[in-house]
């Protein structure tokens, strides 16, 4: 009775269970009753990352420098190349097919998380007591100056975009 299902790492072909090719190898010829599955290693620029019956290996991803990409991890016969973005840029998608410049946090916002090759800058509004007066991809919200510690008084209140202005104590009091 021919099989209708096969074991793990096997496939059914013409009523026969054949071994799948291991990662890093492609299928050349199905097995027979007498011969094991014929598999062949992928070439240097190719890979297959699963047990498979593929007749062609997949091409390694190309990290195109014209798109701001660079190699983070070189591909093997079993893994694809991993691309990342050059300094100052990050991926536009999870598959990292192109790069865009990191965004800057506008005045009134500070950097919560600095961008990486794969993620953009995360900004947060400066809370009360903090400010940012620059457009920056690195600077966090800075605390207002403490006039009291300098034996000064607040002459002008701070905002999320400006520091407080300190002045001398009113001597007439």
């Amino acid at each position: 009775e021919p099989p209708t299902a096969c074991r793990e790492k096997q496939y059914l072909i013409n009523s026969q269970c054949c071994s799948l090719c291991q990662p890093g190898q492609k299928l050349v010829s199905d097995c027979t009753e007498f011969t094991e599955t014929e598999c062949l290693p992928c070439s240097e620029s190719e890979f297959l990352d699963t047990w498979n019956r593929e007749t062609r290996c997949h091409q390694h991803k190309y990290c195109d420098p014209n798109l701001g990409l660079q190699v983070q991890q070189k591909g093997t016969s079993e893994t694809d190349t991993i691309c990342t973005c050059e300094e100052g840029l990050h991926c536009t998608s999870e598959s990292c097919e192109s790069c865009v410049p990191h965004r800057s946090c506008l005045p009134g916002f500070g950097v919560k998380q600095i961008a990486t090759g794969v993620s953009d800058t995360i900004c947060e509004p400066c809370p009360v007591g903090f400010f940012s007066n620059v457009s920056s991809a690195f600077e966090k919200c800075r605390p207002w100056t403490s006039c009291e510690t300098k034996d000064l008084v607040v002459q002008q209140a701070g905002t999320n975009k400006t520091d407080v202005v300190c002045g001398p104590q009113d001597r007439q009091r």
């Epitope: 013409n14 010829s29 199905d30 097995c31 027979t32 009753e33 007498f34 011969t35 094991e36 014929e38």
Partner: antibody, heavy 117, light 109 residues
Framework: QVQLVESGGGVVQPGRSLRLSCAAS????????MHWVRQAPGKGLEWVAV????????YYADSVKGRFTISRDNSKNTLYLQMNSLRAEDTAVYYC??????????WGQGTMVTVSS | EIVLTQSPGTLSLSPGERATLSCQAS???????LAWYQQKPGQAPRLLIY???SRNNGIPDRFSGSGSGTDFTLTISRLEPEDFAVYYC??????????FGGGTKVEIK
């Protein structure tokens, strides 16, 4: 390169024995089934026997069953055909061939066996 | 046992002509497990076509196979001088035995 080379042929008297060898190179011999196919002078191809890659499964043509034995030594990359009780009708060129799901994709150059008194 | 009958026995043609060789099976060949081989005098057979219609590696595209079930055809679109030889079909679906056809000789007219 992938190659099969037969040897052991010759002239032998009826009723006697002969052992043919087929030396394989250029591929992983232990992964492939192997066949013997023969061709009588001026005639067509006749399949003789097959053996599986690990040697456990063997089949024979009715014309040689009980007289011929196919075997292999994977450590020596060699296929054998032990031929006993030879008859005049066994006279032929004997080829070894590699088994695949594509048919017999690699053949040796053949070795001539002549059974004559 | 599947019996394969090849026709014609001999085909006399000139270079550049089209050759059509037939192979008829006594019962259906499962999965189209039918191969075609070429044999020249003093040489071993060479696998041309497998699975009835797939060309083996390195075989020129003037060779093509077709058919299914019990009727199969090998076509050589334009005969080259090196194509004059004997051609055998073989079934490898039902065994034992693996059977060959009687052969078709393609000779120069």
């Amino acid at each position: 390169q992938v190659q099969l080379v037969e040897s052991g042929g010759g002239v032998v008297q009826p009723g006697r024995s002969l052992r043919l060898s087929c030396a394989a190179s250029g591929f992983t011999f232990e992964k492939y089934g192997m066949h013997w196919v023969r061709q009588a002078p001026g005639k067509g191809l006749e399949w003789v026997a097959v053996i599986s890659y690990e040697g456990t499964s063997k089949y024979y043509a009715d014309s040689v069953k009980g007289r011929f034995t196919i075997s292999r030594d994977n450590s020596k990359n060699t296929l054998y055909l032990q031929m006993n009780s030879l008859r005049a009708e066994d006279t032929a060129v004997y080829y070894c061939a590699r088994d695949t799901s594509r048919g017999h994709d690699i053949w040796g150059q053949g070795t001539m066996v002549t059974v004559s008194s | 046992e599947i019996v394969l009958t090849q026709s014609p026995g001999t085909l006399s043609l000139s270079p550049g002509e089209r050759a059509t060789l037939s192979c008829q099976a006594s019962q259906s060949v499962s999965y189209n497990y039918l191969a075609w081989y070429q044999q020249k005098p003093g040489q071993a057979p060479r696998l041309l076509i497998y699975g009835a219609s797939s060309r083996n590696n390195g075989i020129p595209d003037r060779f093509s196979g077709s058919g299914s079930g019990t009727d199969f055809t090998l076509t050589i679109s334009r005969l080259e001088p090196e194509d004059f030889a004997v051609y055998y079909c073989q079934q490898y679906s039902d065994y034992p035995p693996f059977t060959f056809g009687g052969g078709t000789k393609v000779e120069i007219k």
